[in-house]
């Protein structure tokens, strides 16, 4: 999906109002210095591409993020403010239901969410630069 035509201001507002709080809640008990940020992004569409990938694509050591509250809110935000995004999710939703797994917060998942926080902050910074 090409995130170029999204309403970035609206996405930022949703992130600051609610998604960020859920990400921070997920990370509670860990320090920001516990993990190194290894994933970056260069512009707003690129940031959203990386955020989508890290949030919804299961990895061998962290398969359960898509069911977290911050992930559900991220999906809702993208569906709302990115033209045509929702139709790309119809088949993806069915696949996700089939592979639902037991919810376990592993250290690898914490590391992945730490990366997500970094990507979101980068998204906000690139938005501020444009303004």
């Amino acid at each position: 999906y090409d995130f170029t035509n999204c309403d970035f201001q609206k996405i930022e507002a949703d992130y600051l109002r609610t998604i960020s709080k859920d990400l921070i809640t997920y990370m509670s008990g860990t320090k920001s210095t516990d993990f190194n940020n290894t994933v970056s992004c260069s512009n707003r569409p690129h940031c959203l591409t990386e955020i989508q990938s890290l949030t919804f694509n299961p990895t061998p050591r962290c398969a359960s993020l898509a069911k977290e509250m911050f992930a559900r809110k991220t999906k809702a935000t993208l569906a709302l403010w990115c033209p045509g995004y929702s139709e790309t999710q119809i088949n993806a939703t069915q696949a996700m239901k089939k592979r639902r797994k037991r919810k376990v917060t592993t250290n690898k998942c914490l590391e992945q969410v730490s990366q997500l926080l970094g990507l979101w902050r980068r998204f906000i910074r690139t938005l501020l630069k444009k303004q």
Epitope: D14, R17, P83, G84, T93
Partner: antibody, heavy 120, light 107 residues
Framework: QVQLVQSGAEVKKPGASVKVSCKAS????????MHWVRQAPGQGLEWMGT????????DYAQKFQGRVTMTADTSTSTAYMELRSLRSDDTAVYYC?????????????WGQGTLVTVSS | EIVLTQSPGTLSLSPGERATLSCRAS??????VHWYQQKPGQAPRLLIY???QSISGIPDRFSGSGSGTDFTLTISRLEPEDFAVYYC?????????FGQGTKVEIK
């Protein structure tokens, strides 16, 4: 089963406000946005706006900006639509309709409609 | 704002005939079009979503097709209960909009 039950018919004077409620049952309220659509007598469907409980955000059609407020009480699974500064051309049936925000993405269940009559 | 134009405005047909309803978008919207049926005094009812996806409980005589800017709702053999008004709607981008409707009436 999924049900959306709207409040009863209203008669209002021009310049007044109306608040229509829509009580949802049979599904997880925060998994869906609540959209509001109106239909003037003998006319087509007109999208007014939406409130998304999951994100606590709303979006309105340009035509209604500044005159409409959509909210929800998640504790009672009830959505509200308030329209202010009513005019005679606001006479219409007002519908609420749910739409999935993390799946389905379509208005698959509708309320029965609330007739709002604006007359002096 | 995406404008949807439905045609014809009214379709006069007999039971058993085939109905073809058209919906044209003012800009490409991929497959983000849904079709609703509305009978007098009733709320709209979803028939087809994302251009061609069928809904459980909706008779299979209803089908949808199209992508981009041109979409079609087909009723293969009209039953007496199919005479109603049909609306297309786009959810490609906000504000979501409806077509003006096509009335399918008995000839």
């Amino acid at each position: 089963q999924v049900q959306l039950v709207q409040s009863g018919a209203e008669v209002k004077k021009p310049g007044a406000s109306v608040k229509v409620s829509c009580k949802a049952s049979g599904y997880i309220f925060t998994d869906y946005a609540m959209h509001w659509v109106r239909q003037a007598p003998g006319q087509g469907l007109e999208w007014m706006g939406t409130f998304i409980p999951l994100l606590d955000t709303s979006d309105y059609a340009q035509k209604f900006q500044g005159r409409v407020t959509m909210t929800a009480d998640t504790s009672t699974s009830t959505a509200y639509m308030e329209l202010r500064s009513l005019r005679s051309d606001d006479t219409a049936v007002y519908y609420c309709a749910r739409m999935g925000v993390t799946h389905s993405y379509v208005m698959d269940a509708w309320g029965q409609g609330t007739l709002v009559t604006v007359s002096s | 704002e995406i404008v949807l134009t439905q045609s014809p405005g009214t379709l006069s047909l007999s039971p058993g005939e085939r109905a073809t309803l058209s919906c044209r978008a003012s800009q490409p919207i991929s497959i983000s079009v849904h079709w609703y049926q509305q009978k007098p005094g009733q709320a709209p009812r979803l028939l087809i979503y994302f251009a061609s996806q069928s809904i459980s409980g909706i008779p299979d005589r209803f089908s949808g097709s199209g992508s981009g800017t041109d979409f079609t709702l087909t009723i293969s053999r009209l039953e007496p209960e199919d005479f109603a008004v049909y609306y297309c709607q786009q959810t490609f981008s906000l504000p979501y909009t409806f077509g003006q409707g096509t009335k399918v009436e008995i000839k």
